[in-house]
């Protein structure tokens, strides 16, 4: 209840806010988890506490771990966990799930978007946003403030929104962005960047050696009749028929489904007789629809015989 | 190995009609969607349409629409076009290609080495 | 219907060079976009799908990129098999349609 997920890209500035709140007044501990360490309060340090708030200025990968905040009060103490994540920037465009703030929906009559976490930051207008890493131009985008306001909003208008802007700590400046996905509701039905339910990214599937196994990709696209989506497995980052292995296939067709008024399709591959060397291979799950695709990794690893000794 | 094989060059004359057949082989035939491509003489390529072998569903671009039939035969994993109503500018090489689920994303990766049909009186 | 509109309509190369074919949309087609090589006599080869993905046992001296509306072919350095002529193909819509094609000769 008292740990909090926080993530940022390396050489960008990231601000984490303790998770257990107190007055301005309450003095706040911070302590890197693994050593015990204390962070220091002094601003010449590139990672520094500032009261309720913990500062990379800017963050390295180096950084992630577990961070320990105790709020200090005459009467108690509270305390509370960070659990930072700095990523290596990546090289092309497409923003990673793990990357991703949470979803906002739209509609005709109130678009904004609100940049994530920005009331954190010392940071002055006007902000920068992109959409699939292409600037916005044109005069149906207004950034205003810390959100962005899109006039005559359209489905096509979904899709992952990043803002960009500058973190200012005693002169020295920072960049900072932050990506979220924008959904548009619309009564005859929308369409998002897919979701997908299953498998979680990197998750783990035990199996037996010699039992067949089955994975399913599940995913999520919007509401109403969706266009041009679909759920596959890839094998190794290939077409199953092109990795040429007939023990694994995937099922003919995609089952359609409905989750909270949502469309969502999934896909079984099927592993018979699963054998060693398919535990080095890399399932991937995709959901694809207009607005882009979406990649979840399934690694398998061997069931553990169950200990019969007392 | 997937392989897409083709019938025989055809002649005809204005009027008629023409089937032209397409055996797959070395996949799970039902697995792939068939597309028709036909290429004129010293041309680009140009779309005919598509059928679905697992189901049958057809969806024709609509130059064709009511001249163009395509079929499958799951017991022979053999598709088939058949045109009707041939005039000379239908004169040129028809190539089947296959496509994975979903065709949309994936291209047609599979091509047949073609049929050439001459319209001729 | 979609009109794919391809540039150069010919271009000449010698091996070794940076090779680069555009496309272009008459509308939005997200990225379902793919690209073939054909030979004089032979069916057409597909090289990318869905605008950046390298098809299996394609050279990876071919790559794709783009999305919306404006893609590009390129070759980073010519060989001599690669002398043939390159199409684009939308698969966003029906009908599907195929770009004009681009001839890539021999200088």
């Known amino acids: 209840k008292f740990s909090k997920q926080s993530w940022g890209l390396e050489n960008e500035a990231l601000i984490v806010r303790c998770p257990r709140q107190g007055k301005p007044s309450y003095t706040v501990d911070w302590y890197y988890s693994q050593t015990n360490k204390s962070i220091p309060t002094q601003e010449r340090n590139r990672v520094f506490a500032s009261g309720q708030l913990l500062k990379f200025l800017p963050a390295a990968v180096a950084d992630s771990g577990i961070y320990t905040c105790i709020v200090r009060s005459p009467t108690f103490n509270r305390t509370g966990y960070a659990n930072v994540t700095i990523y290596k920037k990546q090289s092309d465009c497409n923003v990673p799930d793990y990357l991703m703030y949470s979803t906002v929906s739209g509609s005709e009559k109130n678009s904004k978007i609100y940049c994530p976490t920005i009331d954190l930051y010392n940071w002055t207008a006007p902000l920068e946003w992109f959409k699939n890493c292409q600037a916005l131009q044109g005069s149906r985008y207004r950034a205003h403030k810390s959100f962005l306001v899109i006039d005559n909003v359209m489905t096509e208008d979904a899709g992952d929104y990043t803002c960009k802007f500058i973190h200012n700590e005693n002169g020295a400046n920072y960049s900072v962005t932050a990506t979220r996905s924008f959904t548009v509701k619309d009564e005859q039905g929308f369409s998002l960047f897919p979701v997908i339910g299953a498998p979680a990214q990197n998750e783990i599937k035990e199996v037996e050696i010699g039992k067949n196994a089955n994975l399913t990709c599940s995913a999520c696209f919007g509401k109403g009749t969706q266009f041009l989506a679909a759920v596959l497995w890839q094998l190794n980052g290939t077409k199953i028929t092109d990795f040429g292995e007939p023990r694994i296939q995937q099922e003919e067709g995609q089952n359609q489904s409905f989750s909270n008024g949502l469309a969502c399709l999934d896909m079984v591959l099927r592993i018979a007789d699963v054998k060693e060397e398919d535990l080095l291979l890399q399932y991937d799950c995709l959901a694809l629809n207009l607005h882009g695709l979406r990649r979840h990794t399934v690694r398998l690893s061997r069931k553990n015989p169950i200990d019969h000794h007392s | 190995q997937v392989q897409l094989v083709q019938s025989g060059a055809e002649v005809k004359k204005p009027g008629a009609s023409v089937k032209v057949s397409c055996k797959a082989s070395g996949y799970t035939f039902t697995g792939q969607y068939m597309h028709w491509v036909r290429q004129a003489p010293g041309q680009g390529l140009e779309w005919m349409g598509i059928?679905?072998?697992?189901?049958?569903?057809?969806s024709y671009a609509q130059k064709f629409q009511g001249r163009v039939t395509m079929t499958r035969d799951t017991s022979t994993s053999t598709v088939y076009m058949e045109l009707s109503s041939l005039r000379s500018e239908d004169t040129a090489v028809y190539y089947c290609?296959?496509?994975?689920?979903?065709?949309?994303?994936?291209?047609?990766?599979?091509w047949g080495q073609g049929t050439t049909v001459t319209v001729s009186s | 219907d979609i009109q794919m509109t391809q540039s150069p309509s010919s271009l000449s190369a010698s091996v070794g060079d940076r090779v680069t074919i555009t496309c272009r949309a008459s509308?939005?087609?997200?990225?379902?976009l793919h690209w073939y090589q054909q030979k004089p006599g032979k069916a057409p080869k597909l090289l990318i799908y869905?605008?950046?993905s390298l098809q299996s046992g394609v050279p990876s001296r071919f790559s794709g990129s783009g999305s919306g509306t404006d893609f590009t072919l390129t070759i980073s350095s010519l060989q001599p098999e690669d002398f043939a002529t390159y199409y684009c193909q939308q698969s966003y819509s029906p009908p599907l349609t195929f770009g004009g094609g681009t001839k890539v000769e021999i200088k």
């Open positions: 290609a296959g496509s994975y689920y979903p065709y949309y994303y994936y291209g047609m990766d599979v």
């Open positions: 509308q939005n087609i997200g990225y379902f």
């Open positions: 869905a605008a950046s």
């Open positions: 059928i679905n072998p697992s189901g049958g569903s057809t």
